[in-house]
Amino acid sequence: GGGGAAPTETQPPVTNLSVSVENLCTVIWTWNPPEGASSNCSLWYFSHFGDKQDKKIAPETRRSIEVPLNERICLQVGSQCSTNESEKPSILVEKCISPPEGDPESAVTELQCIWHNLSYMKCSWLPGRNTSPDTNYTLYYWHRSLEKIHQCENIFREGQYFGCSFDLTKVKDSSFEQHSVQIMVKDNAGKIKPSFNIVPLTSRVKPDPPHIKNLSFHNDDLYVQWENPQNFISRCLFYEVEVNNSQTETHNVFYVQEAKCENPEFERNVENTSCFMVPGVLPDTLNTVRIRVKTNKLCYEDDKLWSNWSQEMSIGKKRNST
């Protein structure tokens, strides 16, 4: 429990409930305490969103949420004299905020972003169905380390998709990655309905490809050593090592979750380097290796985006065809 005595009579409703938007997707509700609340009541506020989601009991007279404003969102607020969830709060007051106006069919679709190598973000979208072909799009973005909303300058086109990329560098030793990037796409003429998205910085991360440093044979094992992409520590990555043998025309793919350089055959203490031993490889044939990496769930929410493949490296000799 919390606060003072909890009178059985219901408290009056909160007053002056209002809602506003900060940045691109930060919705903030504020209210005033109820008029004529019991003097022996230590006020707490019960609030939840329209679909009874995210119930909260707190003493603050504000509540905020980071949400893409593509749909109407409502908050209901009531007052009560304790933190007890079973206590009946006052009459709930509701305040809603609607997305910007416009024909829903004019809004862009499939708005999504990928954070490339923790250094730049690339967003893409499809034009809305009810729009002119000469629509000029603008993407705006905001995150905690920016003082104001920025406009993305590098608009490009890939087939039917439009896109824009902007610098976004991981800040070391901060809670940077616990936050999100807020995105909005609209047109310069104001004819289309704006579209919003929120990109958590722990998801949709695509590393650069790794760089193979060394291939060597020891008995019938192939030792592969590579450098991981900058900005990533090896424990945060999973790997796929592909080995193609020209003679047997075999194509082996190894899914590697841990790639430590512990064998004496590997070069030691090289920073940001990973290693893997491929068993049973014929040294007197040509073997071509390539590697790709992806983030894992130890460090990131998302583990679906593979890097592009590394450049290939070969070892062994190609047999002459007889």
Partner: antibody
Framework: EVQVLESGGGLVQPGGSLRLSCAAS????????MTWVRQAPGKGLEWVST????????YYADSVKGRFTISRDNSKNTVYLQMNSLRAEDTAVYYC???????????WGRGTLVTVSS | EIVLTQSPDFQSVTPKEKVTITCRAS??????LHWYQQKPDQSPKLLIK???QSFSGVPSRFSGSGSGTDFTLTINSLEAEDAAAYYC?????????FGQGTKLEIK
């Protein structure tokens, strides 16, 4: 050269199923929506279904909704149309078309004939 | 749903004549109207995109005009190889809708 080629048509009984394929080449497949359009014998063109380049947006004509399923495999540069609960009125030449720009069809296949008859 | 009405349904013309086919939309569709040609036993081919833009490789005798609800396909100096069905298509919203077609016969 940009090309699309349909396959999988044939004779099927009412209530039966058929799966059409459309193999594409000569362009970055995942950047373009693909569409199925059909033409009943001696009749005009009718839009059937569309799938966006990355496969997140899928649309159907009311006449096939709930019976047909469009899908794509971007690693194989192929789009599919799974047709279930086929009816006589589904008899048509089925064309696969690549979409371009703001939703027009710039490349069409030669079509594959689907005949629904007992 | 957008309804497209083409006229005429059928036209018989002599070579070198000028031909005009019209397409009327049931509501304004901006310039989201495209014209296709389909010769007998062939698949359709794009002629005009966005109401008035010629598609690459299309002979210059084909041109398009209009916006909103009224659109026109014009063939200047008709040639024998232009015998075909012509369709207008709206891409304004979904579903895509096709006109019923205009069949052009060369006398």
């Amino acid at each position: 050269e940009v090309q699309v080629l349909e396959s999988g048509g044939g004779l099927v009984q009412p209530g039966g199923s058929l799966r059409l394929s459309c193999a594409a080449s000569g362009f970055t497949f995942s950047n373009y929506a693909m569409t199925w359009v059909r033409q009943a014998p001696g009749k005009g063109l009718e839009w059937v279904s569309t799938i966006s380049g990355r496969g997140y947006s899928i649309y159907y004509a009311d006449s096939v909704k709930g019976r047909f399923t469009i899908s794509r495999d971007n690693s194989k540069n192929t789009v599919y149309l799974q047709m279930n609960s086929l009816r006589a009125e589904d008899t048509a030449v089925y064309y696969c078309a690549k979409e371009e720009g703001h939703w027009y069809f710039d490349v069409w296949g030669r079509g594959t004939l689907v005949t629904v008859s007992s | 749903e957008i309804v497209l009405t083409q006229s005429p349904d059928f036209q018989s013309v002599t070579p070198k004549e000028k031909v005009t086919i019209t397409c009327r939309a049931s509501q304004s569709i901006g310039s989201s109207l495209h014209w296709y040609q389909q010769k007998p036993d062939q698949s359709p081919k794009l002629l005009i995109k966005y109401a008035s833009q010629s598609f690459s490789g299309v002979p210059s005798r084909f041109s398009g005009s209009g916006s909103g609800t009224d659109f026109t396909l014009t063939i200047n100096s008709l040639e024998a190889e232009d015998a075909a069905a012509y369709y207008c298509v709206s891409s304004w919203g979904l579903p895509y809708t096709f006109g019923q077609g205009t069949k052009l016969e060369i006398k």
